[in-house]
C-alpha cells in the first residue's frame, strides 16, 4: 500500500524555539516515521533537517539548527515505513516574520502600597530578537486577587512601579512583550501574585523638587516626622528601558547620604548632561521607609530653565509683551532647544487682583487694560513635556503705565 504524505504542517516559532506539528494522513498505518528536509532561498539542494529525522510522533523541534532568521526557508516532509511517501512541501517562510515573542520573565518586589515589576525577555540572548532586544516594550494586566477587576497598563519598560495600592493585599499580574517596530505582540507570562506588606510606620518622602542655586543643585522634599536621616539615589533614566545593562544600578549622591534635613545640596558637576531619576528614603535608625516615588530630573532644563526676559510696549488699552531668551551670567542668551509655554501674571499696581495668561508664542498681547494706569507684569516658563513638568521661577515684576486713551493703534 502506498504511504500518503503527511498534511497540514504547522510551523510554530516562539523566541528561539522552532516547533513543527503535522497530521498523519493515514491513522490506520502503524510504525510510520516522518522526516523533514529544508532548503534555503537561492539553493537547489535539500538538506536533512536535524532534530526532525525518523520521528515517530507528529511533532519535532529544530531549534538547534542555526538559521539566518531573516532568510526565507522552505520545508518538506514525508512519511516512511518500508517505502516512503511522496514529499509534501510546506509554504516557504521567513523565521523572523513567523516568530512570536515568548512570555517574559517577571520578578516582583512588594512594598506596602506599591509593587516594583522587573521584566526581562524570556529567552536570554535570543538570536531571534538580537537586533531588537532594546526595543521591547511591555504591557501588563493587574488585578486584586479578591476582586478580579482587571486594570491594563500599556507601554511600560523593563522596570515599572505601580503605586497607590493597598497594604496587605494580594495582587496578581501577567505581562506580555511587544515589538512595535515589527508589529509583534507576545504571549502573556504566567500569572504572578504577590502580597503587599504591612503598612510601613515610616511613609516615603514626598514632593521631591530640584532647584538651582549658584553652582549647586538643591534637592528638597517633605517628610512627616522629625529626627530622621535620609539618603538620595540616582539612576540614568534611559536605563529603565534596559535593566540588563550592567550600569543599571541606583547610586548614592555622596552629599545626600545620611542627611538629617529634608534637603541636600550638591554641586552641579555631580551630574553630566542628561536625564536622571532621583529617589529618597527615610530612616529613624531602626526602621527604613520604602523609596519615594521617583522624579525625573533633566540637567539641561534644570540648569537652564531660567525666568524669561521680556520687553513691554505700552498702548492705551493693552500691553504687547515680547519674550526673549533668558540671559546667563556673562549676559549671553541661553539657547533653549525644547518647547516652552509662558505664564504671564499681571495686575494693577494699586490692586492685588492678579490675572493670568498662558501662551506658547513669544509675543503676547495683554488686553483690556485701562488708560494711564500702572500695571505690573511677571512671567515664568514651563516645559511642555508633561513627564518633566518643570517650571522656572517668576521673573522680577516690571511695572509700566498705559498710554492715554487715543493711542490704541
Amino acid at each position: 500500500k502506498n504511504l500518503k504524505s503527511p498534511q497540514k504542517v504547522e510551523v510554530d516559532i516562539i523566541d528561539d524555539n522552532f516547533i513543527l506539528r503535522w497530521n498523519r494522513s493515514d491513522e490506520s498505518v502503524g510504525n510510520v516515521t516522518f522526516s523533514f528536509d529544508y532548503q534555503k532561498t537561492g539553493m537547489d539542494n535539500w538538506i536533512k533537517l536535524s532534530g526532525c529525522q525518523n520521528i515517530t510522533s507528529t511533532k519535532c523541534n529544530f531549534s538547534s539548527l542555526k538559521l539566518n532568521v531573516y532568510e526565507e526557508i522552505k520545508l518538506r516532509i514525508r512519511a516512511e515505513k518500508e517505502n516512503t511517501s511522496s514529499w509534501y512541501e510546506v509554504d516557504s517562510f521567513t523565521p523572523f516574520r513567523k516568530a512570536q515573542i515568548g512570555p517574559p520573565e517577571v520578578h516582583l518586589e512588594a512594598e506596602d502600597k506599591a509593587i516594583v515589576i522587573h521584566i526581562s525577555p524570556g529567552t536570554k540572548d535570543s538570536v531571534m530578537w538580537a537586533l531588537d532586544g532594546l526595543s521591547f516594550t511591555y504591557s501588563l494586566v493587574i488585578w486584586k486577587n479578591s476582586s478580579g477587576v482587571e486594570e491594563r497598563i500599556e507601554n511600560i519598560y523593563s522596570r515599572h512601579k505601580i503605586y497607590k495600592l493597598s497594604p496587605e493585599t494580594t495582587y496578581c499580574l501577567k505581562v506580555k512583550a511587544a515589538l512595535l517596530t515589527s508589529w509583534k505582540i507576545g504571549v502573556y507570562s504566567p500569572v504572578h501574585c504577590i502580597k503587599t506588606t504591612v503598612e510601613n510606620e515610616l511613609p516615603p518622602p514626598e514632593n521631591i523638587e530640584v532647584s538651582v542655586q549658584n553652582q549647586n543643585y538643591v534637592l528638597k522634599w517633605d517628610y512627616t516626622y522629625a529626627n530622621m536621616t535620609f539618603q538620595v539615589q540616582w539612576l540614568h533614566a534611559f536605563l529603565k528601558r534596559n535593566p540588563g545593562n550592567h550600569l543599571y544600578k541606583w547610586k548614592q549622591i555622596p552629599d545626600c547620604e545620611n542627611v538629617k534635613t529634608t534637603q541636600c545640596v550638591f554641586p552641579q558637576n555631580v551630574f553630566q548632561k542628561g536625564i536622571y531619576l532621583l529617589r529618597v528614603q527615610a530612616s529613624d535608625g531602626n526602621n527604613t521607609s520604602f523609596w519615594s516615588e521617583e522624579i525625573k530630573f533633566d540637567t539641561e532644563i534644570q540648569a537652564f530653565l531660567l525666568p524669561p526676559v521680556f520687553n513691554i510696549r505700552s498702548l492705551s488699552d493693552s500691553f504687547h509683551i515680547y519674550i526673549g531668551a533668558p540671559k546667563q551670567s556673562g549676559n549671553t542668551p541661553v539657547i533653549q532647544d525644547y518647547p516652552l509655554i509662558y505664564e504671564i501674571i499681571f495686575w494693577e499696581n494699586t490692586s492685588n487682583a492678579e490675572r493670568k495668561i498662558i501662551e506658547k508664542k513669544t509675543d503676547v498681547t495683554v488686553p483690556n487694560l485701562k488708560p494711564l494706569t500702572v500695571y505690573c507684569v511677571k512671567a515664568r516658563a514651563h516645559t511642555m513635556d508633561e513627564k518633566l513638568n518643570k517650571s522656572s521661577v517668576f521673573s522680577d515684576a516690571v511695572c509700566e503705565k498705559t498710554k492715554p486713551g487715543n493711542t490704541s493703534k
Epitope: 520578578h107 502580597k195 510601613n200 540588563g244 550592567h246 544600578k249
Partner: antibody, heavy 123, light 107 residues
Amino acid sequence: QVQLVQSGAEVKKPGASVKVSCKASGYTFTSYWMNWVRQAPGQGLEWMGKIDPSDSETHFNQKFRDRVTLTVDKSTSTVYMELSSLRSEDTAVYYCARGGRISFDYDAALDYWGQGTLVTVSS
Amino acid sequence: DIQMTQSPSSLSASVGDRVTITCKSSEVIYNRLAWYQQKPGKAPKLLIYGATTLESGVPSRFSGSGSGKDYTLTISSLQPEDFATYYCQQYWNKPFTFGQGTKLEIK
C-alpha cells in the same frame, strides 16, 4: 546552570590572613551581588558582607568591617574574601552566596551557595 | 541589628507529619524573609523567599506564611529527605541576620 566553586580548606596561625576565592559560572557575573556568610563548627550562619562585581561597591557587617576585604576579578568571574588578624574564633566554614540582581530596588535572598571553605585557625 | 528568633530550636517528628517552624524578628521586616535547609557538611539551600514564594525546584509540601514580625515555615507531610536544620534570614536591613536554626530530627 549556576555554579559557585570555592577554593580549598586552609589552616592558619592566629594573626595571619586568609584569602578565599569563589568562582562563578552559569550566569551574568556582574548582574548579581555576591555575599559571604560564615558558619562556626556546630553554630548558625553569620552574614559578613557583599560586593557588587560590576563596580566593587561593598557593604559589611560592622563586626567584620575592619578585618574583611572583598575584591573581584571580572576577567575570571571570581570574588575574593580576605580576612585578616585571624583568631581562633574565626575557625569556620566560609560560604559565598549569590544575592539579588543589582537592578533590584531592594535586597534579595541568597539563591545559590558555594560548597564552603573550611578555615582553621590554630597555633 | 535585627534579631531573628526561631522556635523550636529542635524538633522530633515522623515521616508524614505536618511540621511548623516559626521565626520572629525584632523589627518589622516587610516580608523580606527567606527560609533555608541545611544538611550536615553541605551548604544551605534556599527554600522560600519573600516570606511566601517557593524557590523553583522546591517541593510544594514546603510553604511559607506570615507578615510584619512573625513568619512560619510549614512542611505539610515530612519526607525522609527533609530531616535537616532550617534557618530563617531577614534581608530587609543590613546586616542580614539569621535565626539560630531549628534541627528537625527523626522521632
